[in-house]
């Protein structure tokens, strides 16, 4: 014998108080699958959470975090504070990157500057708390007699199209 509730589609529930007929989910609730005997309460995105997707009769609301925070956990169950570039989030709050390390994002940890000399290159631009060093050509490339870099093509005058 088929369970009459199996005919109830998503967005409804099988109402035992009304001879197991399919009733629509009440406001602020949903059922994402058919054959449900109850509807689930919609998630409310409050406080540091903000609504990314409204609740419907067939799907739960989805939250993300307000500016200054980012999501953690399944389904954005938690919001973790952002730090500034040049900082990292420790257990006890945002801390500046130590000398020799950088972070160019608002989350994550400070990473060591690239060691240019490991690749036989020189430092072209020094690193900062926010930016990695930029490695330049190797000293051998700068020595006399080394093949020179091809010069750029001369720029065209404005308003002149190529013939």
């Amino acid at each position: 014998l088929q369970d009459p509730c199996s005919n109830c589609p998503a967005g409804t529930f099988c109402d035992n108080n009304r001879n197991q007929i399919c009733s629509p989910c009440p406001p602020n609730s949903f059922s994402s699958a058919g054959g449900q005997r109850t509807c689930d309460i919609c998630r409310q995105c409050k406080g540091v959470f903000r609504t990314r997707k409204e609740c419907s009769s067939t799907s739960n609301a989805e939250c993300d975090c307000t500016p200054g925070f980012h999501c953690l956990g399944a389904g954005c169950s938690m919001c973790e504070q952002d730090c500034k570039q040049g900082q990292e989030l420790t257990k006890k709050g945002c801390k500046d990157c130590c000398f020799g390390t950088f972070n160019d994002q608002k989350r994550g940890i400070c990473r060591p500057w690239t060691n240019c000399s490991l690749d036989g290159k020189s430092v072209l631009v020094n690193g900062t708390k926010e930016r990695d060093v930029v490695c330049g050509p190797s000293p051998a490339d700068l020595s006399p007699g080394a093949s020179s870099v091809t010069p750029p093509a001369p720029a065209r005058e404005p308003g002149h199209s190529p013939q």
Partner: nanobody
Framework: EVQLLESGGGLVQSGGSLRLSCAAS????????MSWVRQAPGKGLEWVSA????????DYADSVKGRFTISRDNSTNTLYLQMNSLRAEDTAVYYC????????????????WGQGTLVTVSS
Amino acid sequence: EVQLLESGGGLVQSGGSLRLSCAASGFTFSSYAMSWVRQAPGKGLEWVSAISGSGGSTDYADSVKGRFTISRDNSTNTLYLQMNSLRAEDTAVYYCAKERAYDYSNYVDFDYWGQGTLVTVSS
């Protein structure tokens, strides 16, 4: 599958006490440090306390030092947080979190979280 299940939250008067538990399964519990973190209404995540795999080393946020005590029972795979002298500002959802190594780091470096248990402190 790693699972962390918190319990013990509830409504308590200011100055009162609660003991939170976190039942862990799906990994070698004694091999990993564990932490408690919390999220107060309208606020971001705040780390509360951490404990090493053996339980021999602990650390606390300044806001709970001297009031909260973290402990663990590796024979039953359970993490605890004893909370005394509770204040209204301790109201939050409390999560237990698995660290990635035997010793806890300075970083917010967790790979698994529980679903959380709500602690409400009324003044």
